[in-house]
């Protein structure tokens, strides 16, 4: 029998310093292209190897990229998105959502978690 | 993709009007300008926009003579030019600015990312 799978979304605020090639990662999504189905949000496409987001190390592919220096990213443009990354400044302030992958076991297994008592 | 399509321009006499329209897509709530450029001559600013309309700027040669618009709705810029002059026949291009919901409209080009490819204003 197989586990389903469930997904674990955590928020995170990641402060980044802009480097010499910018934030270090590429960016999709935007209400006129839309990378996650009935969703426009804005989504990391790729790290860029030795930027300033992989430096960091706590954005990954994959994540949801919320706000920038607290500007709401809902409902923007592909390229509206890209300018506000583009003239954020120095020292940029995201707001992230990490969407983790969980494997459950089968019905009735449990995996090696804490006791319980 | 970004575009800008002008459109309104066109031949006209001496002391008449015109009104240049400049569609946006792949963009929006930017600040807005037009420029014009005539044969030999570097680019001028013409008229600038805040993205939420509320605040317009002009270059000195056309002072009272041009208002400067805009429909959010439809994404559009609009330049109604009056009392035209021989010396107003130039390519008018249209430009938004490059900034997201940018604080504060300029004349500066620099700050101007995407552009029309122009319209043609002759008055004869």
């Known amino acids: 029998m197989n586990g389903r799978v469930d997904y674990l979304v955590t928020e995170e605020e990641i402060n980044l310093t802009r480097g010499p090639s910018g934030l270090g990662f590429n960016i999709v999504g935007g209400t006129d292209q839309q990378y996650v189905s009935n969703d426009s949000g804005i989504y990391v496409s790729r790290i860029k190897e030795n930027g300033a987001a992989a430096l960091d190390g706590r954005l990954q592919e994959g994540d949801k990229i919320l706000s920038v220096n607290g500007q709401d990213l809902k409902n923007l443009l592909h390229q509206d998105a890209v300018d506000l990354f583009r003239n954020a400044g120095y020292a940029v302030s995201l707001r992230v959502q990490h969407r983790l992958q969980v494997q459950n076991g089968p019905i009735g297994h449990r995996g090696e978690g804490d006791p319980s008592g | 993709h970004v575009q800008l399509v002008e459109s309104g321009g066109g031949l006209v006499q001496a002391g008449g009007s015109l009104r240049l329209s400049c569609a946006v897509s792949?963009?929006?709530?930017?600040?807005m300008g037009w420029f014009r450029q005539a044969p030999g001559k570097e680019r001028e600013f013409v008229a600038a926009?805040?993205?939420?309309?509320?605040?317009?700027i002009y270059g000195d040669s056309v002072k009272g003579r041009v208002t400067i618009s805009r429909d959010n709705a439809k994404n559009t810029a609009y330049l109604e030019m009056n009392s035209l002059k021989p010396e107003d026949t130039a390519v008018y291009y249209c430009?938004?600015?490059?900034?997201?919901?940018?604080?504060?409209?300029?004349?500066?080009?620099?700050?101007?990312?995407?552009w029309g490819q122009g319209t043609q204003v002759t008055v004869s």
């Open positions: 430009a938004a600015d490059g900034r997201f919901r940018a604080g504060r409209i300029s004349s500066d080009l620099g700050l101007y990312h995407y």
């Open positions: 926009i805040s993205w939420g309309g509320d605040s317009t």
């Open positions: 792949g963009v929006s709530f930017r600040n």
